[in-house]
Interface confidence: low
């Protein structure tokens, strides 16, 4: 057969379903990988083809589109399920092709079980809800173009296990759910299950999100430098280990960078020749308001590396701050000589 | 400009009916959860209904089934049916645009509002 | 429903004056919590939402506290536009939008 452009299997879109449910899925090529859509491709005489990889085979098999009730159906650039089976997990392929021109991408699929709390190998998106911010919603996802807007779905909501009704702080309303004064009881998975007719007969999407319940932007504060501090002084002899802890506390922004470094005499540690090493952990509250520890560590220090500046610089989105640390060389105790007068003169 | 336009007040006999709009302009409705407040001549404000994002809608208690509130997002457009009308109605009605989806359910832009007359 | 009591019903004072005007919920409603402010033949004006949170655009002079039960409206240095009806209102849980019967501010 002809050359074709083949974009390989695009594990970066590993699409999970679940069981008897109905699925859709949009051919990639046309959303990440031509810079044209479906119908430019469809005007311009191009043919969209289907074909996958059963689980644990390599044989390319066609797509079986003349299942009773069309189970398998395509629709313009839209594969659809209508419902999954266990055993339609594989790698699905679509190619657009003329006589002169081929392009086509792999991706996997699979369809996965989930038990009757709605628990399953399913990885699962996280929304973050600010805590005590006032009303916020979050709404049930990928559920856009399975009925049209002349349907009227029903939308059931769980936390857990549980239908959410007459919760103190949850309420549903239709497609969203409000979260009146989120609060860390809040956190946990939110499922919308999603009930519509097709063709005499009735559908579920299922959906859950995870909710992590994080700090408010209204008490955010710029980063807070615990230590080095002014009550600490780290007095050493040549030939010690200096060993100073930069420790920050970074309220929960979203989308912020938290950054912690050093530099010695205003430079960044590695523009040095000095043998220091900094090792980073960090820690988080539960509502993800982070702290950030950087111990820089001079295994034996010189007098020369006692008289140099520390400073701990940390920024995030909300400003940036630096604290020197108090260093200095440990003044060696003084000898004294003690004599004893043994033989007192007798008079 | 983000405005709001009530329109619909008149003289209305007890037992009539009235449907109250509010315009709005410079925002998609669609977006923004929406109230009615009333206020009776020379006295203080009386939430009447809010129309949310979702299509939940809620009432205060002593309408009691007589006022719907409705929204036509294509339209750009907020309703309130009033049926059943009395004299205790009579009052200016305006609307509200609450603060934001993620805000505290405050009336952040009001309209000028309308004036319902009940009277025989 | 949420019942809002507001005090005093009005109150007279000078500009210059520190004005307060107490909101009580007869239960929690945590800091959901606005104020309005309205002079006569206009629609009322967002001042202070979220019990403290001052709504952009007013003056610094107003504020707000108080959480649970217990609200309060405080006009640091009364100026002459300031003389007004303010109304507090309950924002809790969707199907609540109770007023409180408003406070005239008249001048002294």
């Known amino acids: 057969s002809e050359r074709c452009d083949d974009w390989g299997l695009d594990t970066m879109r590993q699409i999970q379903v679940f069981e008897d449910e109905p699925a859709r899925i949009k051919c990639p090529l046309f959303e990440h990988f031509l810079k044209f859509n479906y119908s430019t491709a469809h005007s311009a005489g191009l043919t969209l083809i289907w074909y996958w990889t059963r689980q644990d085979r390599d044989l390319e098999e066609p797509i079986n589109f003349r299942l009773p009730e069309n189970r398998i159906s395509k629709e313009k650039d839209v594969l659809w399920f209508r419902p999954t089976l266990l055993n339609d997990t594989g790698n699905y392929t679509c190619m657009l092709r003329n006589t002169t021109y081929c392009s086509k991408v792999a991706f996997p699929l699979e369809v996965v079980q989930k038990d009757s709390c709605f628990n399953s190998p399913m990885k699962l998106p996280v929304h973050k809800l600010y805590i005590e911010y006032g009303i916020q919603r979050i709404t049930c996802p990928n559920v856009d173009g399975y009925f049209p807007s002349s349907v009227k779905p029903t939308i059931t909501w769980y936390m857990g296990c549980y239908k959410i009704q007459n919760f103190n702080n949850v309420i549903p309303e239709g497609m969203n759910l409000s979260f009146l004064i989120a609060l860390i009881s809040n956190n946990g998975n939110y499922t919308c299950v999603v009930t519509y007719p097709e063709n005499g007969r009735t559908f579920h999407l299922t959906r859950t999100l995870t909710v992590k319940v994080v700090g408010s932007p209204k008490n955010a504060v710029p980063p807070v430098i615990h230590s080095p501090n002014d009550h600490v002084v780290y007095e050493k002899e040549p030939g010690e280990e200096l060993l100073i802890p930069c420790t920050v506390y970074f309220s929960f922004l979203m989308d912020s960078r938290n950054e912690v470094w050093w530099t010695i005499d205003g430079k960044k540690p590695d523009d040095i020749t000095i043998d220091v090493t900094i090792n980073e952990s960090i820690s988080h509250s539960r509502t993800e308001d982070e702290t950030r520890t950087q111990i820089l560590s001079i295994k034996k220090v010189t007098s020369e590396d006692l008289k140099r500046s520390y400073v701990c610089h940390a920024r995030s989105a909300k400003g940036e701050v630096a604290k020197a640390a108090k260093v200095k060389q440990k003044v060696p105790a003084p000898r004294y000589t003690v004599e004893l007068a043994c033989g007192f003169g007798a008079t | 400009e983000v405005q709001l336009e009530e329109s619909g007040g008149r003289l209305v006999q007890p037992g009539g009916s009235l449907r109250l709009s509010c315009a709005v302009s410079?925002?998609?409705?669609?977006?923004?959860?929406m109230s009615w407040v009333r206020q009776a001549p020379g006295k203080g404000l009386e939430w009447v209904s809010t129309i949310y994002i979702g299509g939940t809608t809620a009432y205060a208690s002593w309408p009691k089934g007589r006022f719907t509130i409705s929204r036509d997002n294509s339209k750009n457009t907020l309703y309130l049916q009033m049926n059943s009308l009395r004299a205790e109605d009579t009052a200016v009605y305006f609307c509200?645009?609450?603060?934001?989806?993620?805000?505290?359910?405050?009336?952040?832009?009001w309209g000028q509002g309308t004036l319902v007359t009940v009277s025989s | 429903d949420i019942q809002m009591t507001q005090s005093p019903s009005s109150l007279s004072a000078s500009v210059g004056d520190r004005v307060t005007i107490t909101c009580q919920a007869s239960q929690s409603i945590y800091s959901f919590l606005s104020w309005y402010q309205q002079k006569p033949g206009q629609a009322p004006k967002l001042l202070i939402y979220a019990a403290s949170d001052l709504e952009s655009g007013v003056p610094s002079r107003f504020s707000g506290s108080g959480s649970g039960t217990d609200f309060t409206l405080t006009i640091s240095s009364l100026q002459p536009e300031d003389f007004a009806t303010y109304y507090c209102?309950?924002?809790?849980?969707?199907?609540?939008?109770?007023f409180g019967q408003g406070t005239k501010v008249v001048i002294k």
């Open positions: 410079g925002f998609s409705l669609s977006s923004y959860d």
């Open positions: 509200a645009r609450l603060q934001g989806a993620n805000y505290y359910n405050s009336l952040a832009l």
């Open positions: 209102q309950c924002n809790y849980i969707i199907d609540y939008g109770a």
